[in-house]
């Protein structure tokens, strides 16, 4: 039975040319996290494997930095970065937990962070 929950940074916005940290946190489970995948729509951005460490997709290597923690930092943001991002926690023995973040990249200098929310 999967008892865990993923808390994410929720709906967030950032300025074009800036950077943003995508964060997820898995709680309420004793399952072992074997790997975390970060995906944008259907594209794999990066993985953090418990044994092998961080590996960033070559397509995003110039603009994606690992961390902090199991989070992911996106740099040199463009309007095209607007969209859904997913943190996918592969765990044992629970299975897979997925968190969703919506990022809006704004042209203006008014970019305020949304509130946190929980995905059961």
């Amino acid at each position: 039975m999967m008892t865990g929950t993923i808390e994410t940074t929720g709906n967030i916005s950032a300025e074009k040319g800036g950077s943003i940290i995508l964060q997820c946190h898995l709680s309420s489970t004793t399952a072992q996290v074997t790997q975390v995948n970060w995906e944008q729509q259907d594209q794999l951005l990066a993985i953090c494997n418990a044994d092998l460490g961080w590996h960033i997709s070559p397509s995003f290597k110039d603009r994606v930095a690992p961390g902090p923690g199991l989070g992911l930092t996106l740099q040199s943001l463009t309007v095209n970065d607007t969209g859904e991002y997913f943190c996918i926690y592969h765990t044992y023995p629970d299975g897979t937990y997925t968190g969703r973040i919506f990022l809006e990249v704004l042209e203006s200098s008014v970019a305020e962070h949304g509130a946190r929310f929980q995905i059961p």
Partner: nanobody, 118 residues
Amino acid sequence: EVQLVESGGGLVQAGGSLRLSCAASGFIFDSYAMGWFRQAPGKEREFVAAISWGGSNTNYADSVKGRFTISADNAKNTVYLQMNSLKPEDTAVYYCAAVRITDGRDYWGQGTQVTVSS
């Protein structure tokens, strides 16, 4: 069926070099991250080095940085571990691992013995 076959181990004097190979079959190479681990007698298996996405990512354990180099030949589906300036504490059975990028599932080779004499 995923298969990993290590080779290249042996006995070498301290300060010497060895090159380990891991020949992989049964999967699409680019879909996996490949790693080397080692286990010394009476100790837990420990991470040594990893490589992924055709060599665009490499990670190393602090204890081997600057001495060991991991590389991959995608055409041959083979991963290498070049080990220089070997020390007696590098003595261990070295294992190759393949980790599926999509979900973290791992596969292991049988290991190859490396012995560094002083």
